[in-house]
Interface confidence: low
């Protein structure tokens, strides 16, 4: 289902699309369109993904822009104001509403935007903790294509003063072809930390087919979070980890 009206209230029954009117051709001047997306259940959350073909006039988002609010209206939590040619990252609501506002001025137009909306679901029990001295960590379904709309957390716990070595045997996630060099990984990505997610030092963000290489963690905790969006699934990844006792811990044996 695609909705390219200038504004609407959308109660999600199945995944669908809303676009700036006329997309993918030039939107028109002096537009102000507002969409309210509502999950059918008050306990559900909403995920939106922007099509990579995103094209709004880029002048510090002063003139043409799309804004996303986490709530029923503009009083909701502000999640971002976007313009230019780089598609925004996916947005997941904290509750059952997302409010989207599109504004264009009287001149200079681009192709506009397309947003896929759906109920946010986490992956099928894809998060896992690892405590053994060695093991294999695989994306869901590997080597088949991984599912869409995942957020899988993998945490390796080993004794303190030990070093975790992580080596990837296979790595194929949806690439982010936009410059510079795919560094954004806006669609599907694997985040790795030396420690807990978002807490320990961030080792890297990876996508595409470039293997992360050999990863070392010395904190006793290595965590990975695997995010996928609502489209274009690849094979995923398979990685082996092993634990090396550090010289300090060896002294206590």
């Amino acid at each position: 289902f695609r909705n390219d009206k200038c504004g609407d209230t959308i109660k999600i029954e199945s995944p669908g699309y809303l676009t700036s009117p006329g997309y993918p051709h030039s939107y028109h001047p002096s537009e102000k369109c507002e969409w309210l997306i509502q999950a059918p259940d008050p306990y559900q959350r909403i995920m939106i993904n922007f099509n990579p073909h995103f094209d709004l006039e880029d002048r510090d988002c002063k003139y043409d822009y799309v804004e996303v609010f986490d709530g029923e209206n503009e009083n909701g939590h502000f999640r971002g104001k976007f313009c230019g040619k780089i598609a925004p990252p996916p947005v997941v609501s904290s509750g059952p509403f997302l409010f989207i506002k599109f504004v264009s001025d009287y001149e200079t137009h681009g192709a506009g935007f397309s947003i896929r909306y759906e109920i946010f679901k986490r992956g099928p029990e894809c998060s896992q903790n690892y405590t053994t001295p060695s093991g294999v960590i695989k994306s869901p379904g590997f080597p088949e294509k991984y599912p869409n709309s995942l957020e899988c957390t993998y945490i390796v716990f080993v004794p303190k003063m030990s070093e975790i070595i992580l080596e990837f045997e296979s790595f194929d996630l949806e690439p982010d072809s936009n410059p510079p060099g795919g560094m954004f990984c806006r669609y599907d990505r694997l985040e790795i930390w030396d420690g807990f997610p978002d807490v320990g030092p961030h080792i890297g963000r990876y996508c595409g087919q470039k293997t992360p290489g050999r990863i070392r963690s010395s904190s006793g905790i290595l965590s990975m979070v695997f995010y996928t969006d609502s489209a274009i699934a690849k094979e995923g990844f398979s990685a082996n980890y092993s634990v090396l006792q550090s010289s300090v811990s060896e002294d206590f044996k």
């Epitope: 009206k5 009117p21 028109h28 192709a111």
Partner: antibody
């Protein structure tokens, strides 16, 4: 002054191929989406294909899988590769700039598909 | 796909006449309607975009109106150079579609 100049048309047999070009000048080519629109002899206008500023492509169902639109911003040129041509593809092919609408058009190039 | 139906398909008028051409969309297209003029052997020329906005350089005798499904192109006082074929086109959604054209001939 905005100018669009098509070339590459001609007579081709059914099943054959042609590559049309559209040389653009007088504006910042890379800042605009571009399109091809065709007009069969004595008939109306038909949208064929478009390409965004960033290279995303769109096609009419009638040409999908047979035609490929592309652009070379370094040469300010739009292309339409036409394969597996059919007699019903006979038309004048116009390239057009996509502004608020098809705001500038080339003079067209005639493609005749006939055995 | 959105179908665009123009009427009449042709009309005869005299210089100085007020001419009205209508265009109907098969579904609501808000104001995403453009009008073009085409003379024999020439490329189309944009006259009106967004239903009622006059393209730069187009004489003010041309005007457009309408919203939703019904649109009108009006030439307030027909001039000799206005004898041509006129097309409407929706830019609301792909595939982009044109009306069948209205040929304005000299009476």
């Amino acid at each position: 002054e905005v100018q669009l100049l098509e070339s590459g048309g001609g007579l081709v047999k059914p099943g054959g191929s042609l590559r049309l070009s559209c040389a653009a000048s007088g504006f910042t080519f890379s800042s605009y989406a571009m399109s091809w629109v065709r007009q069969a002899p004595g008939k109306g206008l038909e949208w064929v294909s478009s390409i965004s500023r960033t290279g995303y492509t769109y096609y009419a169902e009638s040409v999908k899988g047979r035609f490929t639109i592309s652009r070379d911003d370094s040469k300010n040129t739009l292309y339409l590769q036409m394969n597996s041509l059919k007699t019903e593809d006979t038309a004048v092919y116009y390239c057009a700039r996509v502004g608020t609408a098809f705001d500038y058009w080339g003079q067209g190039t005639l493609v005749t598909v006939s055995s | 796909d959105i179908q665009m139906t123009q009427s009449p398909s042709s009309l005869s008028a005299s210089v100085g006449d007020r001419v009205t051409i209508t265009c109907r969309a098969s579904q609501s297209i808000s104001s995403y309607l453009n009008w073009y003029q085409q003379k024999p052997g020439k490329a189309p020329k944009l006259l009106i975009y967004a239903a009622s906005s006059l393209q730069s350089g187009v004489p003010s005798r041309f005007s457009g109106s309408g919203s939703g499904t019904d649109f009108t192109l009006t030439i307030s006082s027909l001039q000799p150079e206005d004898f041509a074929t006129y097309y409407c086109q929706q830019s609301y959604s792909t595939p982009l579609t044109f009306g069948g054209g209205t040929k304005v001939e000299i009476k």
